[in-house]
Interface confidence: low
């Protein structure tokens, strides 16, 4: 195991110092410091940073102070052995003060061996003739990322333009896992596609679902140890069907008497997609209609022949009114007036032998 030390001089004693004395260590620290010329207290140019142990790889803690005649690490209130320090010193050309830097290596085993509720920590202590200065505590933690997500996203079927919430709570880890979302295999960047929003508690919101958002979504948690993928949630954006506008009413289907007119519409505005509902209601509407039957015209009987006229002709007539044509019925064919020669009257001129003269009505 590693040796831990503390200094016996009251100038360097900390409230939280503990451990046994070790002359091998202490002879390095002078009992007194020259008081002339006066030096300032040590100032840390670099303080140790918090660190994470990944798998079994040890971590290095590093600090630098000036002016410093000595510089050592203390971990969990106990001095780290002198031989475990890598120390370097130089003189700052500007100030003429001694700059000392030191590093130590912390193994996973050392961190695991620490008993108690507090995390493993180390801090630097630097000496000058003016006294000591302690750096901040740098915590060393064993990094991990559990395998199981605390909440995984669930697949959803949503209608077009609906808001979608996919929830994700990443596995517990140190350091805390960062979360990103994949759409199929591509990372979602909300800055690039404003329709996506990742909340600060890691949920993915699709503000208005588009057909192109039909995809497999995966929550990815990662820290310095590992990257974990959640189960994949399939989002299907469906489109419910919508009716087109009605056509114009058709003509009455009956040429004569009672019939019907119809109009139609189709479920194409839009057509249902991805399992969306078909349109509800009728695609055809019919209404009753009546078409007046056509009446063909027919002739009346011929009238009597007129008396023989001065031209030696007489005539007779008939009308297309028995019945007259109605509602598109056919007109009568044939003569309205008929005339022919006659010889029973005095004629102004001889009647030639000729055919009957026909006068046609329209």
């Amino acid at each position: 195991g590693s040796h831990h030390h503390h200094h016996h001089g009251s100038d360097y004693k900390d409230d939280d110092d503990k451990g046994s004395q070790d002359d091998e260590f202490f002879h390095e620290l002078p009992e007194t410091f020259p008081s002339d010329p006066p030096e300032p207290l040590p100032h840390f140019l670099i303080e140790p940073e918090e660190a994470y142990i990944v798998k079994n790889k040890p971590v290095n803690l590093y600090c630098k102070a000036s002016p410093a005649t000595q510089i050592y690490f203390k971990c969990n209130s106990e001095w780290v052995h002198q031989k475990d320090h890598v120390v370097d010193e130089r003189v700052d050309e500007t100030s003429g003060l001694i700059v000392r830097e030191v590093s130590i290596e912390i193994s996973r085993q050392q961190v695991e061996e620490l008993f108690g509720p507090e995390d493993y920590w180390c801090q630097c202590v630097a000496w000058s003739s003016a006294g000591t200065t302690k750096s901040r505590k740098a915590y060393v933690r064993i990094a991990y990322l559990r395998k199981t997500f605390e909440q995984e996203p669930l697949g959803k079927e949503v209608s077009l333009e609906q808001e979608v919430l996919l929830q994700c709570r990443p596995p517990e880890g140190i350091p805390v896992a960062e979360v990103e979302w994949l759409k199929n295999e591509d990372i979602i960047d909300p800055a690039e596609d404003r329709n996506f929003y990742i909340t600060i508690d890691h949920n993915l919101i699709i503000k208005q679902a588009r057909l192109s958002d039909t995809a497999n979504y995966t929550c990815v948690a990662k820290n310095i140890v590992a990257k974990r993928k959640s189960t994949t949630a399939t989002v299907i954006v469906y489109v419910n069907g919508g009716w087109s506008t009605w056509t114009e009413w058709s003509v009455c289907n009956s040429r004569c008497g009672r019939g019907y007119q119809k109009r139609t519409r189709t479920c194409t505005n839009p057509a249902p997609l991805n399992g969306g509902a078909f349109c509800e209601g009728q695609s055809v509407q019919k209404i009753a209609c009546t078409t007046l039957c056509p009446v063909d015209g027919r002739w009346t009987s011929w009238s009597k022949w007129s008396t023989c006229g001065t031209e030696c002709t007489h005539w007779r007539r008939r009308e297309c009114t028995a019945p007259a044509p109605k509602n598109g019925g056919k007109d009568c064919d044939g003569l309205v007036l008929q005339s022919k020669n006659c010889t029973d009257g005095l004629c102004m001129q001889a009647a030639p032998d000729s055919d009957d003269v026909a006068l046609y009505g329209s």
Epitope: G173, P175, V176, E178, P190, Y197, T199, I200, D201
Partner: antibody
Framework: QVQLQESGPGLVKPSETLSLTCTVS????????WTWIRQPPGKGLEWIGY???????NYNPSLKSRVTISVDTSKNQFSLKLSSVTAADTAVYYC?????????????WGQGTLVTVSS | DIQMTQSPSSLSASVGDRVTITCRAS??????LNWYQQKPGKAPKLLIY???SLQSGVPSRFSGSGSGTDFTLTISSLQPEDFATYYC?????????FGGGTKVEIK
Amino acid sequence: QVQLQESGPGLVKPSETLSLTCTVSGGSISSYFWTWIRQPPGKGLEWIGYIHNSGTTNYNPSLKSRVTISVDTSKNQFSLKLSSVTAADTAVYYCARGRGMATLPFDYWGQGTLVTVSS
Amino acid sequence: DIQMTQSPSSLSASVGDRVTITCRASQSISSYLNWYQQKPGKAPKLLIYAASSLQSGVPSRFSGSGSGTDFTLTISSLQPEDFATYYCQQSYSTPLTFGGGTKVEIK
């Protein structure tokens, strides 16, 4: 129902260290980001910093050199220490729960405790 | 640091009025914005998170909108209990910062 309650001295002398504790009840402290926010009398809100039970901390750079936030999961408590206080640190100090990671909305707050810095 | 500027700093309104408060960020913060209500002597209360998501238990007369640098909190019909100070807060990057507040007073 999650409840937060601040406790600590209401009067601190200049140059001393202000120490406050926030006790969380009705829920576990083992997740979320536990946050301190302050409000000088008649002024707006200022974020001090937060801690996660994993040990992750984040402090306002304007206060970073003086502030320490720690958590005690066994007691369901987290604490604020602000060193070298001056009259400018007089404020109502609130503890709050931050939902989510790194950047977050504060959905539960303590009722606040007024700390006056005066000799 | 990201500066958050609220306007107006105060306004007078009557019960039933529609009230709009704006918040502007000094740089784009996407939709990472929260709104709080604070009454005298009380802790702030979360109203809206992520720019437009209504916090559970908050009346639906409160709504938020905006993205990028410009955001709006709207109270559709002001109620007597809504007279208070309202703060916006950016949650895009640390340090987390608040707007200076808008005090809504009774006309």
